[in-house]
């Protein structure tokens, strides 16, 4: 399911329950994300070793991951709402190639893997809602995406590993990075 | 095993300095949030800052300012700038190794001993 | 500014006893909470997360429960090791905040 079902029972027993504000249902939808996220990389963990890997000898791929920094306004210091929010979907649009990736690579966590990526994509809808300076947000070349995927496809198998757990580490750090910002809005 | 030592601690007069450092071994400092809390004697655990794994850090309304939180993932080690001390920053002052699943529910699993700073003329 | 206000500040319980320490948070905070034990000296210990997933090693004997602003840590039975203070922690917004803990509970023997 691309959107989180309601957080207990309680919702189907209560049907005067005041319905979510943009605000809380782009922060549920970040940590129902952020679950699944937490359920692939448990499997792929128990495959391979790469989860002991460091971030130094990982920081070696040619993969040009998504990350937040301190010009882009969403630390506590430096905090800029617009220009924060608008490299939130920057950075969501251009990891949906990885999502993409990402498809064919759970064999028990096939339908975990489709949700994150569905979910990913209604969250995107969510936050341009949001978002008052759309001109500012680029999207990513479909030709070069495609490209790319072609190129993460044709590695051997201790490469796409290594790329799947990159890819999970580096969207779990992005989106709390997202909600820490989200949460100041 | 999994260690957090905690160094630097000592007297120091009002308006001074300190660095504060906590050098972790046994495990990647690089893929844990971090955080420094302090206790004054006889008093209750006050949260200092955070700084998670995208280098941001997070502090305490009374920290911003006067201290500097930093991490250093080639030495294993987390550091503490503390300026323009007064008498009532007085305390232990604890490192701790997080886990976070979603924003600041950072659950501190992992503990060092604590270094005590001392703040009087 | 999220605040946590722990009650009661002081318990004076025997050993068997069933005790129960509230939380309350200034605003909601879903489930992101945590408990943590300290004894005299030492440092603190991580006991529930989650509002109420114990930790690997944590005694059955302690459960968490609550959800929003309203938040409790049980202890079924309690043991002579028990007698400590007990800390809340949120975990929804460290923005423009003072304090993340709550101010303590301390369980003394009766």
């Known amino acids: 399911a691309p959107v989180p079902p309601g957080e207990d029972s309680k919702d189907v027993a209560a049907p005067h329950r005041q319905p979510l504000t943009s605000s809380e249902r782009i922060d549920k939808q970040i940590r129902y994300i952020l679950d699944g996220i937490s359920a692939l990389r448990k499997e792929t963990c128990n495959k391979s070793n790469m989860c002991e890997s460091s971030k130094e000898a990982l920081a070696e791929n040619n993969l040009n991951l998504p990350k937040m920094a301190e010009k882009d306004g969403c630390f506590q210091s430096g905090f800029n709402e617009e220009t924060c929010l608008v490299k939130i979907i920057t950075g969501l649009l251009e990891f949906e190639v990885y999502l993409e990736y990402l498809q064919n690579r759970f064999e028990s966590s096939e339908e975990q893997a489709r949700a994150v990526q569905m979910s990913t994509k209604v969250l995107i809808q969510f936050l341009q809602k949001k978002a008052k300076n759309l001109d500012a947000i680029t999207t990513p070349d479909p030709t070069t995406n495609a490209s790319l995927l072609t190129k993460l496809q044709a590695q051997n198998q201790w490469l796409q590993d290594m790329t799947t757990h990159l890819i999970l580490r580096s969207f779990k750090e992005f989106l709390q990075s997202s909600l820490r910002a989200l949460r100041q809005m | 095993e999994v260690q957090l030592v905690e160094s630097g601690g000592g007297l120091v007069k009002p308006g001074g300095s300190l660095r504060l450092s906590c050098t972790v071994s046994?495990?990647?400092?690089?893929?844990?949030?971090l955080s420094w809390v302090r206790q004054a004697p006889g008093k209750g655990l006050e949260w200092v800052g955070y700084?998670?794994?995208?280098?941001?850090?997070w502090y305490a309304n009374w920290a911003k300012g006067r201290f500097t939180i930093s991490r250093d993932n080639s030495k294993n080690t987390l550091y503490l700038q503390l300026n323009s001390l007064r008498a009532e920053d007085t305390a232990v002052y604890y490192c701790?190794?997080?886990?976070?699943?979603?924003?600041?529910?950072?659950?501190?699993?992992?503990w060092g001993q604590g270094t005590l700073v001392t703040v009087s003329s | 500014d999220i605040q946590l206000t722990q009650s009661p500040s002081f318990l004076s319980a025997s050993v068997g006893d069933r005790v129960t320490i509230t939380c309350r948070a200034s605003?909601?905070?879903?489930?992101?909470l945590s408990w943590y034990q300290q004894k005299p000296g030492k440092a603190p210990k991580l006991l529930i997360y989650?509002?109420?997933t114990r930790t690997s090693g944590v005694p059955s004997r302690f459960s968490g429960s609550g959800s929003g602003t309203e938040f409790t840590l049980t202890i079924s039975s309690l043991q002579p090791e028990d007698f400590a203070t007990y800390y809340c922690?949120?975990?929804?917004?460290?923005?423009?905040?003072?304090?993340?803990f709550g101010g303590g509970t301390k369980v003394e023997i009766k």
């Open positions: 701790a190794r997080g886990s976070t699943d979603y924003a600041f529910d950072t659950r501190l699993d992992l």
């Open positions: 700084i998670y794994t995208d280098s941001s850090t």
């Open positions: 989650r509002a109420s």
């Open positions: 046994g495990i990647d400092l690089s893929s844990y949030d």
């Open positions: 922690q949120q975990g929804y917004n460290s923005n423009d905040v003072d304090n993340v």
């Open positions: 605003q909601s905070i879903s489930n992101e």
